[in-house]
Interface confidence: low
């Protein structure tokens, strides 16, 4: 139903608090370098304008689209040209091109300082002095660093952030109460951001059909008792929600997500038996809970898939009449029977099925041609099963840090042109698959591991897209969304790579390393490991191990020394010389 004023409609639906928060998120995700105060000023101006439209929907400019209103507001920023360079050219365009232009300038790796956590007492004072500003600052800092963060979910994180400070700032031991909660929010937030980034990449790079296929598979696993028509309706609505959020339409996205949660809860009897608890929660918690809900039990006595999709004489007729509906039904039926498969595997199977039908339905004897199609699935299923088995075995032997190091070496040899910080970040995250998924029983390992790896490899793809340096990465990232992981797994050592010149500065360390947290120290060591491999890609595991052991001993020794800086300078030179000799540099 059309509304005279879109901005008034959304303000009334969402309420002032959520409206302001979502506009702040939207602006911070577009103009990632703007100071907090400037954004707050813009948000207040938009909010005041929205209130005039609520009072009178026929007032001047109230009939304008949200893109027009928000774009006009962003284009009033005085320093746009000097801060953002060519992004300022977006302001010369008309909608919808202007919004598309802003979207294209979102930066996945903005040049922003690392967020440093202040002392607990300082944070609690700031929280008590001005709670509203404190929470807005949280939204702003997260949104500008994660320009595709799922906005309605960020409201949920902010609610938990507020609850943590409310509870812990009056606790006897504030730090013991607060710090674990903040760590958990940080880790969950990074994971949530990366998962949403994959959804947006799926929509933007591979189109709505790709996203819908993903959603059919995932929702069919989660709601195996729901009818195909019900799953299709949910997929359509979910696609609309994510298309809006990925497109910067955050007010519409949050509003539609709330409607979808309402629909799911009103119809839970025909969707899933697992939704009861979720549906008793308040809106933000409810939506989050539904998104994370466990898979329902599979209906008993599901018939064999072969009857409808292989043995039936009507396969080609059904396929020809409505290709995407028939393939959607295949995907639905396969996914609801296989909660033990990753979504990407299910999509590979569906693609194989589609390719077979395309070929066979044009053949002289279609049925004979596609009769063995399910046999083609076996190697596709076994490949991720074997990969997960071997990597979980490796993880169990090495532990997370050394498992990450094994992956660092592996990936640096595959794509040595990629920047060292990206290789470290991505390999560390790939390595977390062990502690995240290997603890699960066999039936849950593959969906956990392979779908997580898809999220991490998407991080590599979006970071690489900003500054492309490797044809192999581009190829694996762009050819097929569902085959990204197998594509990277299949990459061998890049024999064309010319080793990097040795630079002693790269391996020069100072006393500041001693005050770093264990995680930061690991990152320093892993950075050095990547650089070693880039200098000497043919180095054996044993050589790298020896150098890294010496490096660890050197850091430990100098951090215990009275004159740390002198130790790092003198012993560092010896270490570099010894490493060069050991690696034949």
């Amino acid at each position: 139903d059309a509304h005279k004023s879109e901005v008034a409609h959304r303000f009334k639906d969402l309420g002032e608090e959520n409206f302001k928060a979502l506009v702040l998120i939207a602006f911070a995700q577009y103009l990632q370098q703007c100071p907090f105060e400037d954004h707050v000023k813009l948000v207040n101006e938009v909010t005041e304008f929205a209130k005039t439209c609520v009072a009178d929907e026929s007032a001047e400019n109230c009939d304008k689209s949200l893109h027009t209103l928000f774009g006009d507001k962003l284009c009033t920023v005085a320093t746009l040209r000097e801060t953002y360079g060519e992004m300022a050219d977006c302001c010369a365009k008309q909608e919808p091109e202007r919004n598309e232009c802003f979207l294209q300038h979102k930066d996945d790796n903005p040049n922003l300082p690392r967020l440093v956590r202040p002392e607990v007492d300082v944070m609690c004072t700031a929280f008590h002095d001005n709670e509203e500003t404190f929470l807005k600052k949280y939204l702003y800092e997260i949104a500008r660093r994660h320009p595709y963060f799922y906005a309605p979910e960020l409201l949920f994180f902010a609610k938990r952030y507020k609850a943590a400070f409310t509870e812990c700032c009056q606790a006897a031991d504030k730090a013991a109460c607060l710090l674990p909660k903040l760590d958990e929010l940080r880790d969950e937030g990074k994971a949530s951001s990366a998962k949403q980034r994959l959804k947006c990449a799926s929509l933007q790079k591979f189109g709505e059909r790709a996203f819908k296929a993903w959603a059919v598979a995932r929702l069919s696993q989660r709601f195996p008792k729901a009818e195909f028509a019900e799953v299709s309706k949910l997929v359509t609505d979910l696609t609309k929600v994510h298309t809006e959020c990925c497109h910067g339409d955050l007010l519409e996205c949050a509003d539609d997500r709330a409607d979808l949660a309402k629909y799911i809860c009103e119809n839970q009897d025909s969707i899933s038996s697992k939704l009861k608890e979720c549906c008793e929660k308040p809106l933000l918690e409810k939506s989050h809970c539904i998104a994370e809900v466990e898979n329902d039990e599979m209906p008993a006595d599901l018939p064999s898939l072969a009857a409808d999709f292989v043995e039936s004489k009507d396969v080609c007729k059904n396929y020809a009449e409505a290709k995407d509906v028939f393939l959607g039904m295949f995907l639905y039926e396969y996914a609801r029977r296989h909660p033990d498969y990753s979504v990407v595997l299910l999509l590979r199977l569906a693609k194989t099925y589609e390719t077979t039908l395309e070929k066979c339905c044009a053949a002289a004897d279609p049925h004979e041609c596609y009769a063995k199609v399910f046999d083609e699935f076996k190697p596709l299923v076994e490949e991720p099963q074997n990969l997960i088995k071997q990597n979980c075995e490796l993880f169990e032997q090495l532990g997370e840090y050394k498992f990450q190091n094994a992956l660092l070496v592996r990936y640096t040899k595959k794509v040595p042109q990629v920047s060292t910080p990206t290789l470290v970040e991505v390999s560390r995250n790939l390595g977390k698959v062990g502690s995240k998924c290997c603890k699960h029983p066999e039936a849950k390992r593959m969906p956990c591991a392979e779908d997580y790896l898809s999220v991490v490899l998407n991080q590599l793809c979006v970071l690489h897209e900003k500054t492309p340096v490797s044809d192999r990465v581009t190829k694996c990232c762009t050819e097929s969304l569902v085959n990204r992981r197998p594509c990277f797994s299949a990459l061998e050592v890049d024999e064309t790579y010319v080793p990097k010149e040795f630079n002693a500065e790269t391996f020069t360390f100072h006393a500041d390393i001693c005050t770093l947290s264990e995680k930061e120290r690991q990152i320093k060591k892993q950075t050095a490991l990547v650089e070693l491999v880039k200098h000497k890609p043919k180095a054996t595991k044993e050589q790298l191990k020896a150098v890294m052991d010496d490096f660890a001993a050197f850091v430990e020794k100098c951090c215990k020394a009275d004159d740390k800086e002198t130790c790092f300078a003198e012993e560092g030179k010896k270490l570099v010389a010894a490493s060069q000799a050991a690696l034949g540099l």
């Epitope: 074997n386 088995k389 071997q390 075995e393 490796l394 169990e396 032997q397 090495l398 532990g399 050394k402 094994a406 592996r410 595991k541 044993e542 191990k545 020896a546 052991d549």
Partner: nanobody, 124 residues
């Protein structure tokens, strides 16, 4: 370098037991998978089993499951292969191997260091 020395081989009757030991020396470090392989006369070398560095995970080839057990004592840098209910087809030279475990541990190329082997003969 890591040196591996196997011991404990010999001639036994079918149905008997035998315990092989593999002592590691030199530049040993914990995250080594220790594996046992064997080569029967006129055949390729085949995987028998492996043990993770902590000793909590073991893997076996199907033909020895339930009969052979691998364990390790990191304090002594030694790995053991306890072989029960031996059969004539278990006759082979048994090799101990160490590797850092990047990959599936059933493959020879995953192991960096090898012992010289010890002969096990099972007569019927």
């Amino acid at each position: 370098e890591v040196q591996l020395v196997e011991s404990g081989g010999g001639l036994v009757q079918a149905g008997d037991s035998l315990r092989l030991s593999c002592a590691a020396s030199g530049r040993t470090y914990t995250p080594y998978v220790m594996g046992w392989f064997r080569r029967a006369p006129g055949k390729e070398r085949e995987f028998v089993g492996a043990v993770s560095w902590s000793g909590t995970n073991t893997w076996y080839t199907d033909s020895v499951k339930g009969r052979f057990t691998i364990s390790r004592d990191n304090a002594k840098n030694t790995v053991y292969l306890q072989m029960n209910s031996l059969k004539p087809e278990d006759t082979a030279v048994y090799y101990c191997a160490a590797g850092d475990g990047v990959g599936i541990y059933r493959y020879e190329h995953q192991y960096d260091y090898w012992g010289q082997g010890t002969q096990v003969t099972v007569s019927s």
